[in-house]
Interface confidence: low
């Protein structure tokens, strides 16, 4: 069964500045990645960015930097504004459109245990949903 | 009816900041960004930044970052912008304007303008 | 930041005319391109949204089209409510930043 990880940081040097790396566990070809916060894309969660393979990389403030970092995995830094920067109980979702698998969905958050600039290894998180 | 109701002109001295507020009603909220969008005289818009009412997500123009904070009170349906050390480069007219968030990306609705003369 | 190059700047023309503006930017945007119109002492208004498609309640003697860098707003038999300044606007990445206008006058 295909799986979809996410990892958040908080970067040290930028206390409210986070990095948060996605990836996808399956064998499939993917055809979209988008990112969102404050919950899943589509349930009151709102898009960070998209990433496509051919068509490229759109972001949204306080989206700073996507990238992909390999084939199957994704990186994005988001940049926070006081205030209204997100926080670390802040949920970020990767939602992974691949074929033939069709779309997985995990999101994360920063673990509450962490110091800025650790964080947990990129393990899977819990899949919320699968289209 | 879809309303942005924005606050009176202001008249502030140079080193002072200015709190600009927008009254939004006649749909859901937070179900839209509020964008804030600057016009000097006889010159063009230039986009300071957003706020996503729902969790309060923003995203500035890396020029006005510094000097301009975004907030919002969802329940009272507010937006407001606070523009901090003022010169008189900042007098303007202020707008808000609405976006359906990751829908359809335009602004569809805007503020009928505050404008903030900075003078001693 | 992508820049935002609107021509031409002004334009003086007559009513019944047809009008191209054109907008052209410094990377591709994929569509994600606003028009407005703007009138003397007024709020910006929306014209066109995802480059091409009209809002309900603008009139159909709009048209924009474009792709890639190169978008372009076309006004048919020019009315004269149709003066004023029109700019473009991209959506593809922060910040999102406004072309430089361009001025419709009458001859």
């Known amino acids: 069964t295909p799986e979809v990880w996410v990892q958040v940081r908080m970067e040290a040097t930028e206390l409210s500045s986070f990095t948060i790396r996605c990836g996808f566990l399956g064998s499939g070809s993917i055809s979209l990645v988008t990112v969102s916060w404050g919950g899943p894309n589509g349930a009151g969660g709102t898009t960070l960015a998209v990433l496509h393979p051919e068509r490229g990389i759109r972001q949204w403030a306080p989206a700073r930097q996507a990238r992909w970092e390999t084939q199957s995995s994704i990186s994005l830094i988001l940049e926070g504004s006081g205030a209204s920067s997100p926080c670390a109980n802040t949920t970020f979702c990767c939602k992974f459109a691949s074929f033939p698998e069709g779309s997985w969905e995990a999101c994360g958050s920063l673990p509450p245990s962490s110091d800025p600039g650790l964080s947990a290894p990129p393990t899977p998180a819990p899949i919320l949903r699968a289209d | 009816e879809v309303q942005l109701q924005q606050s009176g002109p202001e008249l502030v001295k140079p080193g002072a900041s200015v709190r600009i507020t927008c009254k939004a009603s006649g749909y859901t909220f937070t179900d839209y960004n509020i964008h804030w969008v600057k016009q000097s005289h006889g010159k063009s818009l230039e986009w300071i930044g957003y706020i996503y009412p729902y969790n309060g997500g923003s995203g500035y123009n890396q020029k006005f970052k510094s000097q301009a904070t975004l907030t919002v009170d969802t329940s009272s349906t507010t937006a407001y912008m606070e523009i901090r050390s003022l010169t008189s480069e900042d007098s303007a007219v202020y707008y808000c304007?609405?976006?359906?968030?990751?829908?359809?990306?335009?602004?569809?609705?805007w503020g009928q303008g505050t404008s903030v003369t900075v003078s001693s | 930041d992508i820049q935002m190059t609107q021509s031409p700047a002004s334009l003086s023309v007559s009513v019944g005319e047809t009008v191209n503006i054109t907008c052209r930017v410094s990377?591709?945007?994929?569509?994600?391109l606003a028009w407005y119109q703007q009138k003397q002492g007024k709020s910006p208004q929306l014209l066109v949204y995802?480059?091409?498609n009209l809002p309900d309640g603008v009139p159909s003697r709009f048209s924009g089209s474009g792709s890639g860098t190169q978008y372009s707003l076309k006004i048919n038999t020019l009315q004269s409510e149709d003066f004023g300044t029109y700019y473009c606007?991209?959506?593809?990445?922060?910040?999102?930043?406004f072309g430089g206008g361009t001025k419709l006058e009458i001859k």
């Open positions: 995802g480059a091409s």
């Open positions: 990377e591709n945007i994929y569509s994600n």
């Open positions: 606007q991209h959506f593809w990445g922060t910040p999102y930043t």
């Open positions: 304007a609405r976006e359906e968030v990751r829908r359809d990306e335009a602004l569809d609705f």
